[in-house]
Interface confidence: medium
């Protein structure tokens, strides 16, 4: 891990690209601009990464430390049940939903929330560090 810290965005962590944060053996990108879900997905894929898929509660709570009240798209969609972008099931957390048309997932510092996929939000990309 970089300079003894759990996570870092510093220049002394060459294993992640500029503007990406390293944690463990992964790199994370927190966007500033906003896009709809599919455009966010395509942004991540074009950068050799994927929309954030969270492995467990530990990773989720760590990432939430970096988030504000603003929601960020993650690689979660309701496709006959809530599943991550790769098709694996969401099984360690619940997701809050107000409507059946809210079929894409977003995260903020407090929770996972369903949203309409056409809404423009910030997003988080994730990839394995080199």
């Amino acid at each position: 891990l970089c300079q003894g810290s759990k996570y870092s965005t510093c220049a002394s962590c060459p294993s992640c690209p500029d503007h990406w944060m390293k944690y463990g053996n992964h790199c994370y990108y927190f966007s500033v601009e906003k896009k709809d879900w599919i455009s966010s997905l395509e942004f991540c894929l074009a950068r050799d990464s994927h929309l954030l898929m969270i492995t467990d509660k530990q990773e989720m709570s760590l990432l939430q430390d970096f988030l504000s009240e603003a929601f960020h798209w993650v690689g979660l969609r309701n496709n006959s049940g809530w599943r991550w972008e790769d098709g694996s099931p969401l099984n360690f957390s619940r997701i809050y939903s107000n409507s059946l048309v809210q079929t894409c997932g977003a995260i903020n510092k407090n929770s996972l929330q369903a949203s309409s996929c056409e809404v423009s939000l910030q997003w988080v990309c994730k990839k394995v560090s080199p």
Epitope: N25, I38, L41, E42, L45, H50, T55, D56, N79, S80, E85, D86, G87, S88, P89, N91, V128
Partner: antibody
Framework: QVQLKQSGPGLVQPSQSLSITCTVS????????VHWVRQSPGKGLEWLGV???????DYNAAFISRLSIRKDNSKSQVFFKMNSLQTNDTAIYYC??????????WGQGTSVTVSS | QIVLTQSPTIMSASLGERVTMTCTAS???????LHWYQQKPGSSPKLWIY???NLASGVPARFSGSGSGTSYSLTISSMEAEDAATYYC?????????FGAGTKLELK
């Protein structure tokens, strides 16, 4: 470089089970899911199931009652087992790595004939 | 289940000829999750085009892909001998994952 190497029997008796091991290198099973697909002259390419990086599994509903996929991350091995094989299960069985958004590397295939 | 129908089943082309094959889905598929694989006899399928139009590593630039919704296609701008193979479309959009029956491309 990324490799998936399969080992398993070529001939299986009807009603017996098929076991195939997929040993991977060049990537970790803790960060990539592994899918299983078979190919037969009659049915083409058929998706059978997947074991996700976190260890959970999903199966094609048509095979769920007789299919089991498990893995050993430390040995970089994925284990495929299908029970109660019949002659129409004769096919080439493949393991394939998932690297979003697609299965990008496939094993060499295990040719399985079900016959007495 | 999403059924993928490929056409034609078999086709032949001369060297230098432009080739187009199609893949039609029974229901809409996200272009991000529509892929093409190339397979030659005795070999495993190789990822050839991913997310509708992106060439996999090492794939010649004469290949291209396009489409959206339920209609997708793979095009070779100028046929070469090494392109003779079977091409399968595949959807990673919805479980169970499915593949087309393939288009076998032969050299005329």
């Amino acid at each position: 470089q990324v490799q998936l190497k399969q080992s398993g029997p070529g001939l299986v008796q009807p009603s017996q089970s098929l076991s195939i091991t997929c040993t991977v290198s060049g990537f970790s099973l803790t960060t990539h899911g592994v899918h299983w697909v078979r190919q037969s002259p009659g049915k083409g390419l058929e998706w059978l199931g997947v074991i996700w990086s976190g260890g959970s599994t999903d199966y094609n509903a048509a095979f769920i009652s007789r299919l089991s996929i498990r893995k050993d991350n430390s040995k970089s091995q994925v284990f495929f087992k299908m029970n109660s094989l019949q002659t129409n299960d004769t096919a080439i069985y493949y393991c394939a790595r998932l690297r979003l958004p697609a299965m990008d590397y496939w094993g060499q295939g295990t040719s399985v004939t079900v016959s007495s | 289940q999403i059924v993928l129908t490929q056409s034609p089943t078999i086709m032949s082309a001369s060297l230098g000829e432009r080739v187009t094959m199609t893949c039609t889905a029974s229901s809409s598929v996200s272009s991000t999750y529509l892929h093409w694989y190339q397979q030659k006899p005795g070999s495993s399928p190789k990822l050839w085009i991913y997310s509708t139009s992106n060439l996999a590593s090492g794939v010649p630039a004469r290949f291209s892909g396009s489409g959206s919704g339920t209609s997708y296609s793979l095009t070779i701008s100028s046929m070469e001998a090494e392109d003779a193979a079977t091409y399968y479309c595949h959807q990673y959009h919805r479980s169970p994952l499915s593949f087309g029956a393939g288009t076998k491309l032969e050299l005329k």
